[in-house]
């Protein structure tokens, strides 16, 4: 009975290994809401997929507890900057948990991309990448936020994205 | 008979797990061809290796279908820039598939690094990192392209590289 | 006897798979020593953890040989720059091995972030991310170095970090 149980467990593990949780969500025209909320993402079209994770209002929702490598890239760009050279961009991955009322910072970057544009009419591009391993419980959510989101450039889902996989 | 089959399958899976596909390719003097093609990479010397993936003319070639975390970093630098502050660099990972005649953009970054050289010295450095999970079929290929590749600096294989592993 | 051995091996593997080596270490006030040594890291508090890897004086120490995706991000920032606009930052992951007296470069980035600050009193932010797959033997160590570390900004463990997981 014990060995049979172990056997079942192994079979189960093999099956679950086949669907090791992973996701890659892509930027879309609807990603930037301007509402102060997190970025929204495409979950099905093109390169986007969900496997063993779910999605809700910008958040990757964990269904199986464990350690996950989570990542996000955002494409930044503009013609000049809203606050000139002093403009700072904060790009972060944040956790929402039922056990705590506020979002928790997981991985964060700050950049001053506008120093690259020495006049108000100068076109500039920059990119911010974040990635790291965090522990997530079932039901917890991860979202991406960018402040100032006016500087995020979206096009075809290849330049701004958000993903995770269990390690 | 069934259990024996399952047993064989588990044994097989254990062996394949031991060779979970992974690769890390490094930049070399021959990486930049100037031909308009993708960057070429070192596959064996130093830190470079291929495990369960193959290589052909700059491309990582998939032998086992699945979801892969693919990544690339390029070291950028120069003395001034060919187009001044307007110089833009596009660094991307692209998929080649037998089912489609053109390369497909997977992950892309655009940067304007030349604003980093604002003093008389004109010397600047920048770096671009890309990483994300994509689904790849057996026989499909992934390549790295950089436009303008004149701004890529190669030295010892640690500053510009390209890799992947199955998740 | 053979099958029982295989069974034990599978059970063992399942257990070891449950503890696939992984770690995420976070920046802390004590990270910057100014001694010329590597950065030091928080290993337990907050988001930091070690699972199947150990830590010693800034180094992730490998206990199980294999291929690892190693990564680090450092948050850079300042008011002006110590060497003016020409300041270059080198951020790297380095291997220490008992078989060789010197550290070996694994993944390295160079950046000139200060070109973003067009006057000596200008505040600027930048970020450097590195990640890639390397083979590590049991007992080998990986450390993070940043030159010039005066430009690294630490706050709460989310902006500068160091991690790894076996692939």
């Amino acid at each position: 009975d014990g060995p049979a149980g172990s056997w079942e467990q192994l079979i189960q593990e093999r099956r679950s290994h086949e669907v090791n949780p992973a996701a890659h969500l892509t930027g879309a025209n609807s990603s930037l809401t301007g509402s102060g909320g997190p970025l929204l993402w495409e979950t099905q079209l093109g390169l986007a997929f969900l496997r063993g994770l779910s999605y809700h209002d910008g958040a990757l929702v964990v269904t199986k507890a464990g350690y996950y490598y989570i990542y996000s890239k955002v494409q930044l760009g503009g013609v000049g900057c809203p606050l000139g050279l002093a403009s700072t961009i904060t790009h972060g991955l944040y956790k929402r948990t039922p056990r705590y009322p506020e979002e928790l910072e997981l991985l964060v970057s700050q950049q001053s991309p506008c120093g690259r544009a020495t006049s108000s009419s100068r076109v500039w591009w920059d990119s911010s990448f974040l990635g790291g391993v965090v522990h997530l419980e079932a039901g917890e959510e991860v979202v991406v936020r960018v402040l100032d989101e006016r500087l995020v450039r979206l096009r075809d889902g290849t330049r701004s994205y958000f993903g995770a996989f269990m390690v | 008979d069934g259990p024996a089959g399952s047993w064989e399958q588990l044994i097989q899976e254990r062996r394949s797990h031991e060779v979970n596909p992974a690769a890390h390719l490094t930049g070399a003097n021959s990486s930049l061809t100037g031909s308009g093609g993708p960057l070429l990479w070192e596959t064996q010397l130093g830190l470079a290796f291929l495990r369960g993936l193959s290589y052909h003319d700059g491309a990582l070639v998939v032998t086992k279908a699945g979801y892969y975390y693919i990544y690339s970093k390029v070291q950028l630098g120069g003395v001034g820039c060919p187009l001044g502050l307007a110089s833009t660099i596009t660094h991307g990972l692209y998929k080649r598939t037998p089912r489609y005649p053109e390369e497909l953009e997977l992950l892309v970054s655009q940067q304007s690094p030349c604003g980093r050289a604002t003093s008389s010295s004109r010397v600047w450095w920048d770096s671009s990192f890309l990483g994300g999970v994509v689904h790849l079929e057996a026989g499909e290929e992934v390549v790295v392209r950089v436009l303008d590749e004149r701004l890529v600096r190669l030295r010892d294989g640690t500053r510009s590289y390209f890799g992947a592993f199955m998740v | 006897d053979g099958p029982a051995g295989s069974w034990e091996q599978l059970i063992q593997e399942r257990r070891s798979h449950e503890v696939n080596p992984a770690a995420h270490l976070t920046g802390a006030n004590s990270s910057l020593t100014g001694s010329g040594g590597p950065l030091l890291w928080e290993t337990q508090l907050g988001l930091a953890f070690l699972r199947g890897l150990s830590y010693h004086d800034g180094a992730l120490v490998v206990t199980k040989a294999g291929y690892y995706y190693i990564y680090s991000k450092v948050q850079l920032g300042g008011v002006g720059c110590p060497l003016g606009l020409a300041s270059t930052i080198t951020h790297g992951l380095y291997k220490r091995t008992p078989r060789y007296p010197e550290e070996l470069e694994l993944l390295v980035s160079q950046q000139s972030p200060c070109g973003r600050a067009t006057s000596s009193s200008r505040v600027w932010w930048d970020s450097s991310f590195l990640g890639g797959v390397v083979h590590l033997e049991a007992g080998e160590e990986v450390v993070v170095r940043v030159l010039d570390e005066r430009l690294v900004r630490l706050r709460d463990g989310t902006r500068s970090y160091f991690g790894a997981f076996m692939v």
Partner: antibody
Amino acid sequence: QVQLVQSGAEVKKPGASVKVSCKASGYTFIDHIMNWVRKAPGQGLEWMGRIYPVSGETNYNQKFMGRATFTVDRSTSTVYMELSSLRSEDTAVYYCGRGSYYWNAMDYWGQGTLVTVSS
Amino acid sequence: EIVMTQSPATLSVSPGERATLSCKASQSVDFDGDSYMNWYQQKPGQPPRLLIYSASNLESGIPARFSGSGSGTEFTLTISSLQSEDFAVYYCQQSIEDPWTFGQGTKLEIK
């Protein structure tokens, strides 16, 4: 083939301004930097600065800052160098020189324009 | 600014012989393994002509008898077998820092 054709010789009085043109052909004009270099009698070559035709961005040798102005007319693939407050020591042959593919050398040059400053 | 010093000021060499011209920079002109040093030839009434870029790269269309070497602060232009058309003034030029600066020139004359 690549050609840079400059405007003709000029004679100017001290305090006046001169504007020299350099018309490019035979290549994609906006892809290459244009530099200005002068050679005074009995002197060596002196770099005055550069212009990026793609954007109009300019970098000047500090020595000429405030007196030299580089402009571009992309419609005619022409760059201009204007030098004001002329003095006798500005008497020289002025050259435009195209930035090479690797942009930190000058691979094609105009034939030169002699500017004489004399009262 | 970076000062470029060429020597000798005048070099007299017979046709068919080898000529070696030197150029010293007041500070290193190297970046990431490349030297930002160029050599030009100028004849009377003509614009300069690029011979060597990045210290040792021969410009397209320039005869192989011209070669460049050096790194850091010391550079050499060598003409292996002088032809009659090689007698001219030669300038070195650094491009690592603004303002770009030239040496004062070496006049290569027929001996």
